[in-house]
Interface confidence: medium
């Protein structure tokens, strides 16, 4: 079955990187395009951006354009979020999901387990 | 970019009973080949969110036929028929027809 | 495996109507959109009519708006296209096609042919 | 409508050479969602079409990988790094970001 599994939380200092991954298996890893969503406390889900496992195609939240970057290791069907010049605000959940096509319509239909970024100095 | 309005926020219920959960868009979600990319999202207490419907009006696989979605344009509905006591959580809409895809705030579904 | 099969083409006057069936088999019909697309005489291809999986949703060309109507009955695994008021330039070969994966149509009938002629 | 224009009609190539088709779109296919929908199918002698590629440069299952696609906004192209005979048939691209979807007018691929 379709699985997402990501890396261990992780605690930063404001101004530092954080690096996500997400190993996907179940399906084929370079068919699907891989999002990646945060989740503030108490704050609504925010899409960060997407990339596209066979060609490394990104399309980003403006938002987060300039300190997201998404990548993908496709031997190892994983993806990556890397977010740099953290700022308390951005302690948050990371999710990673799975966005495919079926029968016309598209929808981000699998999701990972979330990693705790927490941003504290 | 396009704001998703849920409503309520908060949804008492009783087992047995019908749900009903609004979501607006402030843009048309249509596709200029006529789909409509509006997804609905349950996320458990402690848990990842997990995919009821898509498409407006599909029900992804798993789902129970208590879940169903409706709507058009920038007016979207998710009935639950019966409401189960393993039915509550937070309820989203998302959608992705424009970027950045925008989900609304959640609606919390909670037992009386 | 999949398996669309249309039937129902005739030779119909002008002004006049006809129902095409496509029967679907190897997959989960209910779970799929599905469309009309015709191949005219020089061998253009055109859309006629999609509908969503539920059949709540149907969409047309401005060319066939008005005149042709998509259904589908999901029990019967069958996808129909009713066409009235019919006209010399609707003469054409009309395959069913499953929406696939990515958008577009991934499975496609072997055609079943409509002539209109007086 | 958005008008679809292949070139060249015909293409005579030889077993085991290359072979290029172009697509232009009378305005770009880059959709609101970031995705665009330009797809490639074949229709051999006496057969319905076949899907080869979708989402520009997808192959479809079963679809051997001397076949690929490319191209962003408004031009397209489909690739044979080594015709087979068993390639030849008329080919036609596909667009779907806008409606009414629209198909080119084919290009013939016949064997030398």
């Known amino acids: 079955q379709v699985q997402l599994v990501q890396s261990g939380a992780e605690v930063k200092k404001p101004g530092a990187s954080v690096k996500v991954s997400c190993k996907g298996s179940g399906y084929t890893f370079t068919s699907y395009w891989m999002h990646w969503v945060r989740q503030a406390p108490g704050q609504r889900l925010e899409w960060i951006g997407e990339i596209d496992p066979s060609e490394s195609n990104t399309n980003y939240n403006q938002k987060f354009k300039g300190r997201v970057t998404l990548t993908v290791d496709i031997s190892a069907s994983t993806a990556y979020m890397e977010l740099s010049s953290l700022r308390s605000e951005d302690t948050a959940v990371y999710y990673c999901a799975r966005g495919g096509y079926d029968g016309w319509d598209y929808a981000i239909d699998y999701w990972g387990q979330g990693t705790l970024v927490t941003v504290s100095s | 970019d396009v704001v998703m309005t849920q409503s309520p926020l908060s949804l008492p219920v009783t087992p047995g009973e019908p749900a009903s959960i609004s979501c607006r868009s402030s843009q048309s979600l249509a596709k200029s080949y006529g789909n409509t990319y509006l997804s609905w999202y349950l996320q458990k207490p402690g848990q990842s969110p997990q995919l009821l419907i898509y498409g407006i009006s599909n029900r992804f696989s798993g789902v129970p036929d208590r879940f169903s979605g409706s709507g058009s344009g920038t007016d979207f509905t998710l009935k639950i028929s019966r409401v189960e006591a393993e039915d509550v959580g937070v309820y989203y809409c998302l959608q992705g027809t424009h970027q950045p895809y925008t989900f609304g705030q959640g609606t919390k579904v909670e037992i009386k | 495996e999949v398996q669309l099969v249309e039937s129902g083409g005739d030779l119909v006057k002008p002004g006049g109507s006809l129902k095409l069936s496509c029967a679907a088999s190897?997959?989960?019909?209910?779970?799929?959109?599905m469309s009309w697309v015709r191949q005219t005489p020089d061998k253009r291809l055109e859309w006629v009519a999609s509908?969503?999986?539920?059949?709540?949703?149907?969409h047309y060309p401005d060319s066939v708006k008005g005149r042709f109507t998509i259904s589908r009955d999901n029990a019967k695994n069958t996808l129909y296209l009713q066409m009235s008021s019919l006209k010399s330039e609707d003469t054409a070969m009309y395959y069913c096609?499953?929406?696939?994966?990515?958008?577009?149509?991934?499975?496609w009938g072997q055609g079943t042919t409509l002539t209109v002629s007086s | 409508d958005v008008v679809m224009t292949q070139t060249p009609l015909t293409l005579s190539v030889t077993i085991g050479q290359p072979a290029s088709i172009s697509c232009k779109s009378s305005?770009?296919?880059?959709?609101?969602?970031?995705?665009?929908?330009l797809n490639w199918l074949l229709q051999r002698p006496g057969q319905s079409p076949k899907r080869l590629i979708y989402?520009?440069?997808k192959l479809d299952s079963g679809v051997p990988d001397r076949f690929t696609g490319s191209g962003s906004g408004t031009d397209f192209t489909l690739k044979i790094s080594r015709v087979e005979a068993e390639d030849l048939g008329v080919y036609y691209c596909?667009?779907?970001?806008?409606?009414?979807?629209?198909f080119g007018g084919g290009t013939k691929l016949e064997i030398k």
């Open positions: 190897g997959f989960t019909f209910s779970s799929y959109g």
């Open positions: 305005q770009s296919l880059l959709d609101s969602d970031g995705k665009t929908y």
């Open positions: 989402l520009v440069s």
């Open positions: 096609a499953r929406h696939g994966t990515g958008v577009g149509f991934d499975y």
């Open positions: 596909w667009q779907g970001t806008h409606f009414p979807q629209t």
């Open positions: 509908i969503s999986s539920g059949g709540s949703y149907t």
